[in-house]
Interface confidence: medium
C-alpha cells in the first residue's frame, strides 16, 4: 500500500469539521495576469499581494496592477490600491521588504517614457500607509536595504549611477558614476565596481573595486583589474585578471579589502567561472568551473582564512555562468549539504556530505523503494534528488528540496531510486535524520511545505487539472489525511506559508476560469484546531544528531562536537507554537583524523581518512601567498576543519614560515591603495 495508507495510521479525529471552520476563501476582483506575494515582518500576519495585468495594445502595452493587504495571515484581504494612487507597479522589481521587523516596504512604479526619474511608494508601518516619492533617477535595480540600518537604501540607475538614501528613500544622492555592481557589506559599508572607459561589459576584467564606509563621503580603491566580486560570510572575494594572459584568480580579504591574499585555487580562463556556493563565518564552499563547456567543475572548501583550499568534490554539476547547480544547504542539520555530480557516462547522481564537505557519499536507498530502470543491480542503488537542474530541464519537478532550521532533521525532496537521476515522474521522499535515511513519502510530484516547526507537513499534488484537495501529515510524513478545501476545483499556482515554518496557516493560490473571465483566488487554512493542545515535556524525545551507532562513544561527532536535540515525538499531535525554540545540547568530542582537512598539497584517497601528498607536489616546497607575502608551509598534511570544536585525541602539527618575499601577485598591495573624499 502507498505510504500512510496502511492500517497503522492513527486518524486525526474530526479533522474535516475542524478544518472547514478554519478555511477562508478570498476571491480577488482581478483579471488573471500575474500575482506576487510578500510577507511583511515576522509573526505580524501581514501579507502584501500585488496582481498585475498587461493588455497588449497595437502600439504599446497597457498595464494595470492592484495591491492587497492582509493582516491575519491571508484569511482576509483588503484592496489598498488607492494608497498607491492606483499606480502601475513594476513587478520585475518586486516588493522590496525591509530587513527584520522594520515594517518597511518599497514599491517601484512604472512611469511614462519622458519623465525625469522613477517613482517609488514607501511605507514604514507594515503597508498601512504609503508615501509617494519621485526619484531623481530611473532605477535599474530594486532598492537594497542596509542589513544594519533599514533607513539606508542603495540603488543603481539606468545610467550606472550609484544612488544612496539615508532617510528611507525620502532624499537621494548620487555618490558615484560608472558603477557596475554594488553590495552592502557589514557596518553599513558599500562595495562597488566601477568602469573607466566604455561600459561594464567592455571593461570586464579592468574594473576597479571601491569601498565607502560613510555612505559616500569618502572612498577607498581596494582593488584593480577586477572581473567581479562577491561577499560570503566574513569573506570578501574578488576575481582578478592576471597580468600576462586572460586568466583570472580569486583573491580574498577578511578585513573589508584592506589586505588581500591570493586564494589557493586554480585560475580560470575567459569561458570559465567561480561561484561561491555557500559561506558562513567559518569557511566557504567554492565551485571552480572546468575548462571547456563541460557543465561541471570542482568544489573546494576553504580554511578559516578563505585562503588554503581542499578539493571537496570532483565533477560537480554546474552549467554555464549563472546557470544551474543542485547545491543545497540542508538547514535542518548542521554540516549537511546535497548536490549533484555529472558522471563519466553523463548521467547525473546525487551526493551528500554530513561533515561540511569533508566526505561525500551517495544517498542511502529508501527501504520502501525498488531500484528503477537506471540501476544495473536491482538490489543496489541510491536515492537521487531532483533540484534546480531538474527544474530548469522542465522535468516534472514542481519544487526544490525543502528543509527548515527549526524543523530539526527534516528534509523533503523529489527523487528517484536508481544509479542516477531518472527522467521518469519522480516521487517525494522524506528524511527525518538530516539525510542519513530516506522514506518514500508521497507517490508522484507534489508541492509541499512545513508548518509549526515540523508539527505539520502539507502537500498538494502537482497536476495539470484543477484541484480541490490538500494532504496533511502530523507525524513527519508517515501518515496522510486528505481534506477537500473547496467544492469547485481551482487551477493551482502555489502554496504560501510564512517563512520560517512557524506558522500554522497555509494559503493555496490559484485561479478559477469560466467562459468569460478568470480570477485569482486564495484559500487560507488554519491548522490550529488540528493541533488542539500545546506540546508538553512528555511530547519530546532526546535525539542524537548524526547518530549511526548509538552505543559508540564517538557516535554523533561531527566537526568536533555532538548535539542532542529535543524533538517532537511522531505520535504527539500538539502545537510546537510560534515561540518554539530548538532545544539542543552540544558536547565536545575527541579529535580524530576526520576533524582535519587535507592541507595544501595533500589529498584523501577514497575510503581513507589519512591525507597523502599529491604526487605532482611531492618533494616540492609548498609556498603560498598570504597578505602579499610568500609563505613556506611545513605540514604533515592536515589542518583543522573551520568551525571544528574537538579537543584532545590526535593533533597533527602544522607550521607556517614567513619567507618575507613579495608574492608574484598582480593585485594591489595595501601600501599602494589610494583613498579619496567627496
Amino acid at each position: 500500500s502507498a505510504p500512510g495508507e496502511d492500517e497503522e495510521c492513527g486518524r486525526v479525529r474530526d479533522f474535516v469539521a475542524k478544518l472547514a471552520n478554519n478555511t477562508h476563501q478570498h476571491v480577488f476582483d482581478d483579471l488573471r495576469g500575474s500575482v506576487s506575494l510578500s510577507w511583511v515582518g515576522d509573526s505580524t500576519g501581514v501579507i502584501l499581494v500585488l496582481t498585475t495585468f498587461h493588455v497588449p495594445l497595437v502600439i504599446m502595452t497597457f498595464g494595470q496592477s492592484k495591491l492587497y493587504r492582509s493582516e491575519d495571515y491571508g484569511k482576509n484581504f483588503k484592496d489598498i490600491t488607492d494608497l498607491i494612487n492606483n499606480t502601475f507597479i513594476r513587478t520585475e522589481f518586486g516588493m522590496a521588504i525591509g530587513p527584520e521587523n522594520s515594517g518597511k516596504v518599497v514599491l517601484t512604479a512604472e512611469v511614462s517614457g519622458g519623465s525625469r526619474g522613477g517613482r517609488i511608494f514607501r511605507s514604514s508601518d507594515f503597508a498601512k500607509n504609503f508615501v509617494q516619492t519621485d526619484l531623481p533617477f530611473h532605477p535599474l535595480t530594486q532598492m537594497m536595504y542596509s542589513p544594519q540600518n533599514s533607513d539606508y537604501l542603495l540603488a543603481l540607475s539606468t545610467e550606472n549611477g550609484l544612488w544612496v538614501s539615508k532617510n528611507f528613500g525620502g532624499k537621494w544622492e548620487e555618490i558615484h558614476k560608472a558603477v557596475c555592481l554594488a553590495k552592502w557589506g557589514s557596518d553599513n559599508t558599500i562595495f562597488f565596481t566601477t568602469y573607466a572607459n566604455g561600459s561594464c561589459k567592455a571593461d570586464l576584467g579592468a574594473l576597479e573595486l571601491w569601498r565607502t564606509s560613510d555612505l559616500g563621503k569618502s572612498f577607498k580603491t581596494i582593488g584593480v583589474k577586477i572581473y567581479s566580486f562577491g561577499l560570503g560570510g566574513r569573506f570578501l572575494f574578488a576575481s582578478v585578471m592576471a597580468d600576462k594572459d586572460t586568466t583570472r584568480r580569486i583573491h580574498v580579504s577578511t578585513d573589508q579589502g584592506d589586505t588581500w591574499s591570493m586564494a589557493q585555487l586554480p585560475s580560470v580562463g575567459q569561458e570559465q567561472f567561480y561561484s561561491i556556493l555557500a559561506a558562513n563565518d567559518d569557511m566557504v564552499f567554492m565551485h571552480v568551473d572546468e575548462p571547456g563547456d563541460t557543465g561541471f567543475g570542482t568544489i573546494f572548501t576553504s580554511d578559516d582564512r578563505g585562503i588554503v583550499y581542499s578539493k571537496s568534490l570532483d565533477r560537480h554539476l554546474y552549467t554555464t555562468t549563472g546557470g544551474e547547480t543542485d547545491f543545497t544547504n540542508v538547514t535542518s542539520l548542521r554540516g549537511v549539504y546535497i548536490t549533484s555530480v555529472l558522471s563519466e557516462d553523463n548521467s547525473i547522481q546525487t551526493m551528500i556530505t554530513f561533515d561540511q564537505g569533508g566526505r561525500w557519499t551517495h544517498l542511502r536507498k529508501p527501504e520502501n523503494s525498488e531500484c528503477d530502470a537506471t540501476a544495473k543491480n536491482k538490489n543496489e542503488c541510491s536515492l537521487h534528488i531532483h533540484a534546480s537542474y531538474s527544474i530548469s530541464q522542465k522535468l516534472n519537478v514542481p519544487m526544490a528540496p525543502l528543509s527548515e532550521p527549526n524543523a530539526v532533521g527534516i528534509v523533503i525532496a523529489h527523487g528517484s531510486v536508481g544509479d542516477a537521476i531518472s527522467v521518469m515522474v519522480p516521487d517525494v521522499y522524506i528524511s527525518d535524520d538530516g539525510g542519513y535515511s530516506w522514506t518514500k513519502m508521497l507517490e508522484g510530484p507534489h508541492y509541499y511545505t512545513i508548518l509549526d516547526s515540523g508539527g505539520i507537513i502539507v502537500a498538494i499534488e502537482h497536476s495539470s487539472r484543477p484541484i480541490n484537495v490538500i494532504k496533511f501529515s502530523t507525524d513527519e510524513g508517515q501518515c496522510w489525511q486528505t481534506y477537500t478545501f473547496t467544492r469547485d476545483p481551482i487551477y493551482f499556482t502555489g502554496l504560501a506559508s510564512e517563512p520560517g515554518a512557524r506558522s500554522m496557516n497555509i494559503s493555496i493560490w490559484g485561479f478559477t476560469e469560466s467562459f468569460l473571465t478568470s480570477q485569482w483566488v486564495s484559500y487560507t487554512i488554519d491548522f490550529k484546531d488540528i493541533l488542539e493542545r500545546n506540546c508538553e515535556e512528555k511530547d519530546y524525545t532526546i535525539w542524537l544528531a548524526h547518530s549511526t551507532d548509538p552505543e559508540d562513544y564517538e557516535d554523533g561527532c561531527i566537526l568536533g562536537y555532538k548535539e542532542q536535540f529535543l524533538r517532537l515525538r511522531k505520535s504527539s499531535v500538539c502545537q510546537n507554537g510560534r515561540d518554539y525554540v530548538v532545544t539542543k545540547q552540544p558536547s565536545i568530542c575527541l579529535c580524530s583524523l576526520e576533524d582535519f582537512l587535507c592541507d595544501f598539497g595533500y589529498y584523501r584517497p577514497e575510503n581513507d581518512s589519512k591525507c597523502v601528498e599529491q604526487p605532482e607536489l611531492k618533494g616540492h616546497d609548498l609556498e603560498f601567498c598570504l597578505y602579499g607575502r610568500e609563505e613556506h608551509l611545513t605540514t604533515n598534511g592536515y589542518r583543522k576543519i573551520p568551525g571544528d570544536k574537538c579537543q584532545g585525541g590526535v593533533n597533527p602539527v602544522r607550521e607556517v614560515k614567513d619567507l618575507k618575499k613579495k608574492c608574484t601577485s598582480n593585485f594591489l598591495s595595501p601600501e599602494k591603495q589610494n583613498s579619496k573624499s567627496n
Epitope: I542, D549, E554, D555, Q564, Q585, S587, L590, S592, Q647
Partner: antibody, heavy 118, light 107 residues
Framework: EVQLVESGGGLVQPGGSLRLSCAAS????????MSWVRQAPDKRLEWVAI????????YYSDTVKGRFTISRDNSKNSLYLQMNSLKAEDTAVYYC???????????WGQGTLVTVSS | DIQMTQSPSSLSASVGDRVTITCHAS??????IGWLQQKPGKAFKGLIY???NLKDGVPSRFSGSGSGADFTLTISSLQPEDFATYFC?????????FGGGTKVEIR
C-alpha cells in the same frame, strides 16, 4: 550483568610505575568509550583520562599528561592505565567507567587503591 | 577548565524529607551534566544524565533540573537507601570535572 572490575593497585614509591587493568563484561566493550576517574583521600573526584571506543583517540587531564597512558584491548575486553613517574598526589582509588554517546559515566567499577608513598 | 561548585557539602535530613542539592558551573554547559550516587563499599551509580533524564531503574523520586550554569538534584521524599554521597559531573568539554560532593546523612 554489566560489570567492570579494576585490578593492579597497590603501594608504590614516588617515581615508580604501576599498571592498572579493568576487565569488562556483560556489554559490547568495543563500542564504548572508557574513562579512568580517581577519588583522592579527601573524597574529591578527578577525571584522569578517556579513550575512544576503537582505541585511536585519547585525552588526559593536565595533571597526568605525559606520565599516564590509557590503552585498551578490545579482543580481551580490557582497559589499561599505565602510570609512570608517580607522585604522592596520585594517591587515590582509581575507577574505570563506561561512556556511551548519550551518557558519559553510566557504569563504574568498584575501584582499586593506589598508594604512592616512600 | 570548567569548575563545578556543589552545595551544600553535607546535609542532615529525615526519611520523607525533600532534599535539594545544587551545582554551579563556572561557564555554560548546556545540559551536559550528570548526577552520581556513591555509597560506602559500593560502585558509583549513575542517576541522572543530560540534566533532567532519569537513568533506567532509578526511582522517580529523583529528578534533575536546570540548564546553562545552574543545576539541581532533587529527592522528593528521602528513603533510607538514599543516604549516600552525591556528585555532579560536567561532560560538555574536556577535561570533565566533578563537583565536590554532598553527603546526605540521617538526622
Amino acid at each position: 550483568e554489566v560489570q567492570l572490575v579494576e585490578s593492579g593497585g597497590g603501594l608504590v614509591q614516588p617515581g615508580g610505575s604501576l599498571r592498572l587493568s579493568c576487565a569488562a563484561s556483560g556489554f559490547t566493550f568495543s563500542t564504548y568509550g572508557m574513562s579512568w576517574v580517581r577519588q583522592a583521600p579527601d573524597k574529591r573526584l578527578e577525571w584522569v583520562a578517556i579513550i575512544s571506543s576503537g582505541g585511536s583517540y585519547t585525552y588526559y587531564s593536565d595533571t597526568v599528561k605525559g606520565r599516564f597512558t590509557i590503552s585498551r584491548d578490545n579482543s580481551k575486553n580490557s582497559l589499561y592505565l599505565q602510570m609512570n613517574s608517580l607522585k604522592a598526589e596520585d594517591t587515590a582509588v582509581y575507577y574505570c567507567s563506561r561512556s556511551s554517546s548519550h551518557w558519559y559515566f553510566d557504569v563504574w567499577g568498584q575501584g582499586t587503591l593506589v598508594t604512592v608513598s616512600s | 577548565d570548567i569548575q563545578m561548585t556543589q552545595s551544600p557539602s553535607s546535609l542532615s535530613a529525615s526519611v520523607g524529607d525533600r532534599v535539594t542539592i545544587t551545582c554551579h558551573a563556572s561557564q555554560g554547559i548546556s545540559s551536559n551534566i550528570g548526577w552520581l550516587q556513591q555509597k560506602p563499599g559500593k560502585a558509583f551509580k549513575g542517576l541522572i544524565y543530560h540534566g533532567t533524564n532519569l537513568k533506567d531503574g532509578v526511582p522517580s523520586r529523583f529528578s534533575g533540573s536546570g540548564s546553562g550554569a545552574d543545576f539541581t538534584l532533587t529527592i522528593s521524599s528521602l528513603q533510607p537507601e538514599d543516604f549516600a554521597t552525591y556528585f555532579c559531573v560536567q561532560y560538555a568539554q574536556f577535561p570533565y570535572t566533578f563537583g565536590g560532593g554532598t553527603k546526605v546523612e540521617i538526622r
